[in-house]
Interface confidence: medium
């Protein structure tokens, strides 16, 4: 039965962890806005994309930027459900 | 292209502005990063104002640093100068993507002297 | 507060030897790898010759190789030229929201 305890324990730290990880990785991507070279919110006297990746080194830009998009997305509903859970959860007490 | 203009000899307590002015690129999509370094000291990282006009500080700077732009300029503000902040201040361009980040844009820096 | 060590303070170096500097960390960088290294001449600003820990910036000589991740991290220049004469220094960016220059060295070419 303490094995079990301490198992729950464990899982239980673990996700706050990964919680208070996930929190720390949005809030340091926010921070940072848009990479300049991804060309995210770029206005109409940025350089295009070609022009910034002249030198070739990321010819997949605009996946990685996606990717980006995607990490950003997934961190924030992730964090934003967890959110409203918890005010769900104070509102049941 | 980057470059920082306002440097001057001041004395201890009176506010100083720098600027950074910038051109090629556009401060709506960059990040800017002010470093800087004393005489013949090693560079320290002073903090950068993001592409959304938020701003960022080092740890030991929050407070007596503070950073603003318009569409073209970057300027860093020092509230209250001491001796310990005579230095010279490079403006640099804040790259980043999720796999890397880089300053890859360097102005040639101007100096600030805090005196009495 | 994070601390990144550079190794050695200065190093001396002949032409056409090697030289490879250390830089340690006492937190990972953010993605373990958000580490740069930048060349500075006196009187110049510092050049970014490596981001990324091993990208290549434009313009550089191949000759100059970064290696390493997460906490540890190398700057490696093979066949050292006279005009390599320089201070070096890393530069670690974290999750913290922070960046931080390691101390530098000193690289004298004979």
């Known amino acids: 039965r303490r094995d079990v305890a301490h198992g729950i324990l464990n899982e239980a730290y673990r996700k706050v962890l990964d919680q208070l990880s996930a929190g720390k990785h949005l809030q340091s991507l926010v921070a940072r806005g848009v990479g300049g070279s991804l060309g995210g919110g770029a206005g109409d006297d940025a350089e295009p994309l070609s022009k910034r990746h002249s030198d070739g080194i990321f010819t997949d830009s605009y996946s990685r930027y996606r990717k980006q998009m995607a990490v950003k997305k997934y961190l924030a509903a992730v964090l934003g459900k967890r959110y409203k859970q918890r005010v769900k959860n104070k509102g049941r007490r | 292209s980057v470059e920082e203009s306002g440097g001057r000899l001041v004395t201890p307590g009176t506010p100083l502005t720098l600027t950074c002015t910038v051109s090629g690129f556009s401060l709506s999509t960059y990040n800017m990063c002010w470093v800087r370094q004393a005489p013949g000291k090693g560079l320290e990282w002073v903090g950068f104002?993001?592409?959304?006009?938020s701003a960022y500080y080092a740890s030991w700077a929050k407070g007596r640093f503070t950073f603003s732009k318009t569409s073209t300029t970057v300027d860093l503000k020092i509230a209250s100068p001491t001796t310990e902040d005579t230095a010279t201040y490079f403006c640099a361009r804040y790259d980043w993507d999720y796999y890397y980040s880089r300053l890859d844009l360097w102005g040639p820096g101007t100096l600030v002297t805090v005196s009495s | 507060d994070i601390v990144l060590t550079q190794t050695p303070a200065s190093v001396s170096a002949a032409v056409g030897g090697t030289v490879s500097i250390s830089c340690q960390s006492s937190?990972?960088?953010?993605?373990?790898?958000?580490l740069s290294w930048f060349q500075q001449k006196p009187g110049q600003p510092p050049k970014l010759l490596i981001y990324?820990?091993?990208t290549l910036a434009s313009g550089v000589p191949s000759r100059f190789e970064g290696s390493g991740s997460g906490t540890q991290f190398t700057l490696t220049i093979s066949d050292v030229q006279c005009d390599d004469a320089a201070t070096y220094y890393c530069?670690?960016?974290?999750?913290?929201?922070?960046?931080?220059f390691g101390g530098g060295t000193e690289v004298v070419v004979k």
């Open positions: 530069l670690g960016d974290y999750i913290i929201i922070e960046n931080i």
């Open positions: 937190e990972s960088v953010y993605n373990n790898n958000y």
């Open positions: 104002i993001n592409s959304d006009d």
């Open positions: 990324g820990a091993s």
